[in-house]
Interface confidence: low
């Protein structure tokens, strides 16, 4: 921690510029006032501070603030966003999508720090809700972020917010997050047409229930087999033969290939042979 | 096939610190979450806490958010449970287990005891 | 947090016989949403981890036999062993997985 010394004469910083690189530590923690940083902490990013002097400012509004920064300051930290941890960002209130924004272009291209992802978990939990436009705003930076979430975060994603989500965006996500997902999409979705809806809930059916596959097959989607693997075992083993061929179209030759693979290998099991015969594939029951 | 297994249990003294590992292996660590679980002897399961190992996010049980940490390297798809302050009823069989929502695959345990 | 309070805590039982395990919650695990039940059962044998048998209330885990069946919604649950084999004697936990992570006590299932 950096000593408390008096000011030396004339060095009283009357702006934040550039003339603060060449003091030294204890100079800008006794002759920065941090009223006046906290007023022009945009001017902090402009200027080429050392870690160690980015350590004394952090310090002056930590000092200035020991219950969480306003969300004036913390839209401005830039670059001083890197040295806030976890527990300093659990005390903020960010309700802004353009502070948000602004924090995540600090960190883009990183992966998620544990900043990152406590900030968001903070603005998610402020707003109560993942809303389209926060949903679109945190893919573009973290296309993976939809399927870090856990079950109270991913409960709180309206069925509007569906339509920011891009296939992948869902790529990392497992059957039981895509069992929450499932039913907000067919709702989202609900007033397309038949091949519309299809492209547009293709990425979610790894949620489906049988029920919702048996509809899909009357429809002749011609459902690809890397769709038909990622869905839910209990909701395949239901289906008929007859049914599994008009769901896959002209990719149902592609069971050969996965026959040793669930949860082709399970529906094969149950299935009677002759029915599986039907198909002309040498599926073996 | 997935494996966790948790090491670093033992004895320690009232008031010790203790560091437990889990690794894992047999799936990508980072799209799980990694939970720890305690069973005193003879009684049931608490809840510890949880990291999400691709960010470093953690959440805990509030009875333990301030003696203990639970941190992970992605490097080494190990998770770590640091106690710290131990005391004797924190005594019991540490367990990690992988999440999504529901704990579906658990380490076979280590076993702390804190005596004097 | 959401409590979890199994019943009875103990029971003795026979091979070949209907055993019925309950578990009540504090506060409905329901998420309305998917009308799913964020309910899980876990079998545990003296110095084993945990082993998943259950989850959603109803679907058993892969590879579990089908002895073992949940069911149950909102706060009352129940874990049925249609005919109770050798290996199933052990101690059954529910768990809930909808506000962060509670167990039942556990119900210890003795040899008569």
């Known amino acids: 921690e950096v000593e408390k010394t008096a000011c030396p004469s004339g060095k009283k910083a009357r702006e934040i510029d550039e003339s603060l690189i060449f003091y030294k530590k204890w100079e800008l923690e006794a002759c920065v006032d941090a009223a006046l940083l906290a007023t022009q902490m945009d001017r902090v990013n402009a200027i080429p501070f050392t870690y160690e002097q980015l350590d004394v400012l952090k310090h002056k509004l930590d000092e200035l603030y020991p219950q969480g920064y306003p969300e004036s300051v913390i839209q401005h930290l830039g670059y001083l966003f890197l040295k806030m941890s976890p527990e300093d960002i659990r005390k903020w209130n960010v309700t802004s999508l353009e502070t948000l924004k602004a924090l995540l272009e600090v960190n883009k291209g990183h992966e998620m720090s544990p900043q990152v992802a406590t900030l968001i978990d903070r603005f998610v939990k402020g707003r109560g809700q993942l809303d389209k436009d926060t949903l679109d705003t945190l893919t573009a930076f973290y296309p993976g972020y939809l399927c870090s979430l856990s079950p109270e975060e991913l409960s709180s994603v309206p069925p509007s917010s569906i339509w920011a989500v891009r296939p992948q965006d869902l790529d990392t996500c497992d059957p039981r997050q895509l069992d929450v997902l499932y039913p907000k999409a067919r709702l989202a979705f609900q007033n397309m047409n038949g091949s519309e809806y299809f492209v547009k809930i293709q990425s979610f059916l790894g949620g489906a229930p049988t029920e919702d596959l048996k509809a899909l097959s009357q429809q002749n989607v011609s459902m690809d087999l890397a769709t038909f693997m990622k869905l839910r075992t209990d909701a395949v083993l239901p289906l008929t033969v007859a049914e599994v061929q008009k769901l896959l179209g002209p990719h149902v030759e592609g069971l050969k290939a996965e026959e040793r693979h669930r949860p082709v290998r399970d529906w094969i099991l149950r299935q009677r042979q002759d029915d599986l015969d039907t198909l002309g594939l040498g599926l073996q029951g | 096939e997935v494996q966790l297994v948790e090491s670093g249990g033992g004895l320690v003294q009232p008031g010790g610190s203790l560091r437990l590992s889990c690794a894992a292996s047999?799936?990508?660590?980072?799209?799980?979450?990694m939970h720890w679980v305690r069973q005193a002897p003879g009684k049931g399961l608490e809840w510890v806490g949880y990291?999400?190992?691709?960010?470093?996010?953690?959440e805990y049980n509030q009875k333990f958010k301030d003696r203990f940490t639970i941190s992970a390297d992605t490097s080494k798809n190990t998770a770590y449970l640091q106690m710290n302050s131990l005391r004797a009823e924190d005594t019991a069989v540490y367990y990690c287990?992988?999440?999504?929502?529901?704990?579906?695959?658990w380490g076979q345990g280590t076993l702390v005891t804190v005596s004097s | 947090d959401i409590q979890m309070t199994q019943s009875p805590s103990s029971l003795s039982a026979s091979v070949g016989d209907r055993v019925t395990i309950t578990c009540k919650s504090s506060?409905?695990?329901?998420?309305?949403?998917?009308?799913?039940?964020?309910l899980a059962w876990y079998q545990q044998k003296p110095g084993k981890a945990p082993k998943l048998l259950i989850y959603?209330?109803?679907t058993r885990e892969s590879g579990v036999p089908s002895r073992f069946s949940g069911s149950g919604s909102g706060t009352d649950f129940t874990l049925t062993i249609s005919s109770l084999q050798p290996e199933d004697f052990a101690t059954y936990f529910c768990?809930?997985?909808?506000?962060?992570?509670?167990f039942g006590q556990g119900t210890k299932v003795e040899i008569k």
């Open positions: 768990h809930q997985y909808l506000s962060s992570y509670t």
């Open positions: 506060q409905s695990v329901l998420y309305s949403s998917n009308q799913k039940n964020y």
């Open positions: 959603w209330a109803s």
């Open positions: 287990a992988r999440s999504r929502w529901l704990l579906d695959y």
């Open positions: 047999g799936y990508t660590f980072t799209t799980y979450w």
């Open positions: 990291i999400r190992p691709s960010t470093g996010y953690t």
